[in-house]
Amino acid sequence: FERTRSLQDPCSNCPAGTFCDNNRNQICSPCPPNSFSSAGGQRTCDICRQCKGVFRTRKECSSTSNAECDCTPGFHCLGAGCSMCEQDCKQGQELTKKGCKDCCFGTFNDQKRGICRPWTNCSLDGKSVLVNGTKERDVVCGPSPADLSPGASSVTPPAPAREPGHSPQ
């Protein structure tokens, strides 16, 4: 790297991936290993983020850009830039301070992360429960009881069995 000769700031011509080295009379020196500078004119290179523990490297550090991390299997990212890794739970569970716990009756979680949420209250929309909720799934609301003809059930009857050899459409 040639020494820059700018009259204003001798460091201004140092490109990304280098730093202006005061120990070497302000010559542009390449960033040391495991460090980077993403813009020109830098007086230091930033040390690369190290993806360790529950973090794993999603993108390697280069001389001009920082490393990016995600989470090891069984964990998922939280926050911008994957600042934290949180343990996965099964569907039908939520993560508490004591670990993964099943959703309480009347609540569900259809993901491996997040909290258990209450089943939808169909009656608030004037509807009836078409399919009951579980720990993993919300209820399915159907038409309002008034919309049903007399004698009709609010739960759909089972679909007829398909004939062998027919694939679903």
Partner: antibody, heavy 118, light 112 residues
Amino acid sequence: QVQLQESGPGLVKPSETLSLTCTVSGGSISSYYWSWIRQPPGKGLEWMGYIYYSGSTNINPSLKSRVTISVDTSKNQFSLKLSSVTAADTAVYYCARDQSGGGSFQHWGQGTLVTVSS
Amino acid sequence: EIVMTQSPLSLPVTPGEPASISCRSSQSLLYSNGYNHLDWYLQKPGQSPQLLIYLGSNRASGVPDRFSGSGSGTDFTLKISRVEAEDVGVYYCMQALQTPPTFGQGTKLEIK
């Protein structure tokens, strides 16, 4: 270049809460971890905890019940609160930019001495 | 937590002579990515600590090349090839493998 500046009262009474703010200039608070580290007079360094700009925190277990760290990205600041202080909390308090979430403190504030005394 | 132990705690050195500081960790700092997660810091009198070495052996940008770090696993060394008057202060090793990061007790380097 990145500069950090601690601010807050230099004297706190026992049992009260110590509050400090670190202002980051010359760069954005985004995309890094930001730590608090303290040093009692004539002694060594103790890491207290970090915050990511998104608000995620990690606190030293030895201080967990007493420490709160928060961030204000609009002001490029992060803050430390230490409750129920005693004379043992008298120290120089440093804020620092943490490159990896618990490692390689590349940029430090100049430190501020907080004395706990009645 | 990981305990860091430094020796010696005091190191009188003649200018121009080499100096060496040892740091030992209570468990290995070698991670599966092949890096030793150990930093070295220098705190000059009345100043904040400054990073010298990261990942065991990488000199931070702007740090003079008379400083070098070596070692792996649990045993690490900071060497100064020729001590200068401006190198006086307290040197700390720090493990950056696990939270909480922990520091050694410090080694005070002084000029004879």
